[in-house]
């Protein structure tokens, strides 16, 4: 079953300021995606997050899985360069985590590197991962163009929230100490589309908040997703089923520091891509190992 952690997620009544350490098993769908692109000299290394949809599939943002050296072209990384960690809590201690290589890397065919429209991708794992208390899929939303309603509260987790100055090598190698060794999470409200659009249109630079995106965060700043959180799931508790649903994927934000005032985080609106996701996974919704909330 999807979207039901063995450990109950925190109540959404109280607002969290900044990020908090997650308890192990709180976000059992959370994946750390490590990319080492050896096709370039010297090798490029970076990381992002993703969400487990089934024993074999990870949902993430397309920009996490594209080569970093040609900023105006979309070159998917080779599957050989991708490693996925599941059941990971502390990046310094990968011993308890399941690591898997990729069998396939699938970027959305319309992903636009200029404005990050259609920023969604899938990784098929080489071998199905065993599910358990710390490794469980999240639910996909219903197919609905509106996406999550304004002011709804959601949670997003990642290893990049605490310290935007941490180097990639520090995150990837297990022996180093950083401020975001332990998975962090933050609670954020969905921002009305018009408000977010206006906020970005008023900035210098060519920012486009499309209908395939939604925003989350606080006007006053102070809590946000940041570098290294890309591709991570923005989850909302579905009232009817009481399951956690991936409504968004960490996509982009303004040029200011993470958590700046009136700079909302922008997320891929997953509900616009449910059909595409099922099509790639090759399983009709009814027989899906994870599932869609009904």
């Amino acid at each position: 079953e999807c979207g039901q952690p063995s450990r109950s997620l925190p109540s959404l009544v109280k607002r969290i300021i900044g990020g908090r350490n997650a308890e192990p098993g709180l976000f059992p769908w959370q994946a750390l995606i490590v990319v080492e692109d050896t096709s370039r000299v010297p090798n490029d290394k970076w990381f992002g997050s993703g969400a487990l949809l089934s024993e074999s599939w990870i949902l993430t943002a397309a920009h996490v899985l594209r080569s970093q050296r040609r900023d105006t072209t979309v070159i998917p990384v080779s599957k050989e360069h991708v490693t996925v960690y599941l059941g990971l809590h502390d990046v310094r201690d990968k011993s308890g985590a399941v690591n898997s290589s990729a069998a396939r890397v699938v970027l959305h065919p319309d992903f636009n590197i200029q404005n990050y429209n259609h920023d969604i991708a899938l990784v098929q794992l080489q071998e199905p991962v065993p599910l358990g208390p710390h490794v469980m899929p999240v639910c996909l939303p219903r197919l609905e163009p509106e996406g999550p309603s304004p002011h709804m509260l959601g949670l997003v987790a990642g290893w990049g929230i605490s310290n935007p100055n941490v180097t990639v090598d520090e995150i990837i190698s297990s022996g180093t100490r950083t401020l975001s060794d332990v998975l962090q999470y933050v609670k954020l409200p969905v921002v009305p589309h018009a408000e977010c659009k206006t906020s970005y249109e008023s900035r210098s630079g060519n920012y486009s908040v499309t209908e395939n995106m939604f925003c989350a965060g606080y006007y006053e700043g102070g809590k946000d997703t940041c570098l290294g959180d890309s591709g991570g799931a923005f989850v909302i508790l579905d009232d009817l089923s009481q399951r956690w649903v991936v409504q968004g994927l960490v996509s982009w934000g303004g040029p200011e520091e993470c958590g700046s005032k009136q700079v909302y985080g922008v997320y891929t609106k997953v509900s616009n891509y449910v059909d595409w996701v099922w099509e790639q996974m090759g399983s009709p919704q009814g027989r899906a190992p994870g599932g869609t909330v009904s």
């Epitope: 050896t38 096709s39 370039r40 080779s78 990639v168 890309s230």
Partner: antibody, heavy 113, light 112 residues
Framework: QVQLKQSGAELMKPGASVKLSCKAT????????IEWVKQRPGHGLEWIGE????????NYNEKFKGKATFTADSSSNTAYMQLSSLTTEDSAMYYC??????WGTGTTVTVSS | DIVMTQSPSSLAVSAGEKVTMSCKSS????????????LAWYQQKPGQSPKLLIY???TRESGVPDRFTGSGSGTDFTLTISSVQAEDLAVYYC????????FGGGTKLEIK
């Protein structure tokens, strides 16, 4: 060690095509991008484009689209660049390089009637 | 395209002197995901192919003498030769690979 050996100098007529080769040794040829660069006196260095031999993926500088075509033969560890519809502007030294680091020996192309 | 501007276009120094040359890009070369500046420095001696000296703006390629140092981030970069040797006579080019690669016009180093 990594080496890129390029084919010999070419003297060509305007309108003709030429195919330059770049043979790689000392590393796994299929796994690294091969870039091509043009150098003309007084014009500095210009990036033409690149190919990833293992997949055949290519990227071209807009300026050279339609002029240059990249191919690669994994069995002989050789990358090729074909230049078509040659003009005197194509007279230059052409280099291949392994993504960023090691440069080939260079091939001089002269276009003259 | 990202425009790379090198200065000076040429300079002449005596052996043993310190020399610095500049490379400026029309936009930032710092990739926020890999946290690297995609800027390389190459040395091209007369009649030879270019040779990589520095990558990621400040990492010296193996085998390159430690008198060569790269520095800078974002849009402003510098190559410093702490004590110029006669064999350093060459043209020095910077290249960005953040986007479709472009080269600077080069700095020609002459030895007095």
């Amino acid at each position: 060690q990594v080496q890129l050996k390029q084919s010999g100098a070419e003297l060509m007529k305007p309108g003709a095509s030429v195919k330059l080769s770049c043979k790689a040794t000392g590393y796994t040829f299929t796994g690294k991008w091969i870039e091509w660069v043009k150098q003309r006196p007084g014009h500095g260095l210009e990036w033409i484009g690149e190919i990833l031999p293992g997949t055949g993926s290519t990227n071209y500088n807009e300026k050279f689209k339609g002029k240059a075509t990249f191919t690669a033969d994994s069995s002989s560890n050789t990358a090729y660049m074909q230049l078509s519809s040659l003009t005197t502007e194509d007279s230059a030294m052409y280099y291949c390089l392994r993504s960023e680091d090691v440069w080939g020996t260079g091939t001089t192309v002269t276009v003259s009637s | 395209d990202i425009v790379m501007t090198q200065s000076p276009s040429s300079l002449a120094v005596s052996a043993g002197e310190k020399v610095t040359m500049s490379c400026k890009s029309s936009q930032s070369l710092l990739n926020s995901r890999t946290r690297k500046n995609y800027l390389a420095w190459y040395q091209q001696k007369p009649g030879q192919s270019p040779k990589l000296l520095i990558y990621w703006a400040s990492t010296r390629e193996s085998g390159v003498p430690d008198r060569f140092t790269g520095s800078g981030s974002g849009t402003d970069f510098t190559l410093t030769i702490s004590s110029v040797q006669a064999e350093d006579l060459a043209v020095y080019y910077c290249k960005q690979s953040y986007n479709i690669p472009t080269f600077g016009g080069g700095t020609k180093l002459e030895i007095k």
